[in-house]
């Protein structure tokens, strides 16, 4: 379970039309459910139930986004429509280049993601929890444009990353 180094850049526009970028670094773990690869894309927050619909025409986003899913406590979702692995697969099928799960409220999902699939996804499936998850969700919940870059090596200098 290698460390995933995640950089999140939040873009905030000003009234003059300029924008400011805020970069936040956090760490997660690559799970065995996916590949240990770098990935980058615009963050799309997905509700766990939003991954239930099996309608393949519901590809609302172009390929290359990073899905962020906050898992609920098992008590609040006693009959999940898909396993955590199933949710990751569904997100990738819909065009996610990577999936990040916040497992803070459902840590047993870590075991499920690391059970080792015979057919692991070819995109990274990362999990975060605790303070790192709080940082990520604080950004995601601002509902502003944000991009995530996932790396399996520690980042170098932030200025090298995002080609604007």
């Amino acid at each position: 379970k290698e460390t995933a180094f995640v950089e999140v850049v939040l873009f905030e526009s000003s009234p003059s039309g300029d924008y400011t970028t805020y970069t936040t670094g956090l760490t997660g773990r690559f799970s065995r459910a996916g590949a240990t690869l770098s990935a980058e894309g615009e963050i799309v927050q997905m509700h766990p139930l939003g991954l239930c619909n099996n309608n393949d025409e519901e590809d609302l986003y172009e390929y290359g986004w990073v899905g962020v899913v906050k898992l609920e406590q098992p008590e609040l979702d006693p009959k999940p429509c898909l396993t955590v692995l199933g949710k990751a697969k569904r997100a990738v099928q819909r065009g996610a280049t990577a999936v990040i799960f916040d497992v803070s409220e459902n840590p047993e999902a870590i075991d499920q993601l690391n059970q080792g699939s015979e057919d692991p996804l070819k995109r990274p499936v990362v999990y975060v929890k605790g303070a790192d998850a709080i940082k990520l969700m604080n950004i995601v919940n601002k509902q502003k444009v944000a991009r995530a870059r996932i790396q399996h090596r520690p980042p170098r200098q932030p200025t090298e990353y995002f080609d604007m």
């Epitope: 098992p74 008590e75 006693p78 009959k79 459902n106 840590p107 047993e108 870590i110 075991d111 499920q112």
Partner: antibody, heavy 118, light 110 residues
Framework: EVQLVGSGGGLVQPGRSLKISCAAS????????MAWVRQAPTRGLEWVAT????????YYRDSVKGRFTISREYAKSTLYLQMDDLTSEDTATYFC???????????WGQGVLVTVSS | QAVLTQPNSVSMSLGSTVKLSCTLN????????VHWYQQYEGRSPTTMIY?????PDGVPDRFSGSIDSSSNSAFLTINNVEIGDEAIYFC?????????FGGGTKLTVL
């Protein structure tokens, strides 16, 4: 290998208290909700209590609310059930179980016999 | 209060197929998962079927689970019954935030 080992049972008089334990190994204890399920002699299974993975919430069947307290100790990977004001109706074998997604009890301990009698 | 009802006992001959039922008296059986446990005399229960129809590793494929919404029931089917299948089988679900178990079916193999 997941293992749940119960202990602390015995004979207790009505109105008295008893605390039973369940030592967990073979998995990350802090990831999972845990539960106690009991089985009276020649009877079926009866859910008693559940505690969430982080111990922040616990749930009880109506007949034990206010008398039983489920708790967990992470340093020892141990689940507890404190039983107060016991009655003969509480006589049973108490199983600890791991509670996982879908509200499944996927692994069960070997059972702790609690007999309430004067 | 929701109740899961199972027949008390079923006797089947060696090599036959048995279908054990578990009926929910109120609410929709499809709203929550049904799980099945096997319990030998004096032993702890073990999971045979979870999430309606999933089989844990190590459980023979002779065991299968299903749901029938028309009868509001869950079923555990055991094909090619063996002597070692003689046990009590309990169904379990989580209904209205309460864990409920069926009374158990004692399977006797003749």
């Amino acid at each position: 290998e997941v293992q749940l080992v119960g202990s602390g049972g015995g004979l207790v008089q009505p109105g008295r208290s008893l605390k039973i334990s369940c030592a967990a190994s073979g998995f990350t204890f802090s990831y999972y909700g845990m539960a106690w399920v009991r089985q009276a002699p020649t009877r079926g299974l009866e859910w008693v209590a559940t505690i969430t993975y982080n111990g922040s919430k616990s749930y009880y069947r109506d007949s034990v609310k206010g008398r039983f307290t489920i708790s967990r100790e992470y340093a020892k990977s141990t689940l507890y059930l404190q039983m107060d004001d016991l009655t003969s109706e509480d006589t049973a074998t108490y199983f600890c179980a791991r509670r996982t997604t879908g509200m499944l009890f996927d692994y069960w301990g070997q059972g702790v016999l609690v007999t309430v009698s004067s | 209060q929701a109740v899961l009802t199972q027949p008390n006992s079923v006797s089947m001959s060696l090599g036959s197929t048995v279908k054990l039922s578990c009926t929910l008296n109120s609410g929709n059986i499809e709203n929550n998962f049904v799980h099945w446990y096997q319990q030998y005399e004096g032993r702890s229960p073990t999971t045979m079927i979870y999430n309606d129809d999933k089989r844990p590793d190590g459980v023979p494929d002779r065991f299968s689970g299903s749901i029938d919404s028309s009868s509001n029931s869950a079923f555990l089917t055991i094909n090619n019954v063996e002597i070692g299948d003689e046990a009590i089988y309990f169904c379990h679900s989580f209904v209205s935030s309460i864990h409920i178990f069926g009374g158990g079916t004692k399977l006797t193999v003749l």
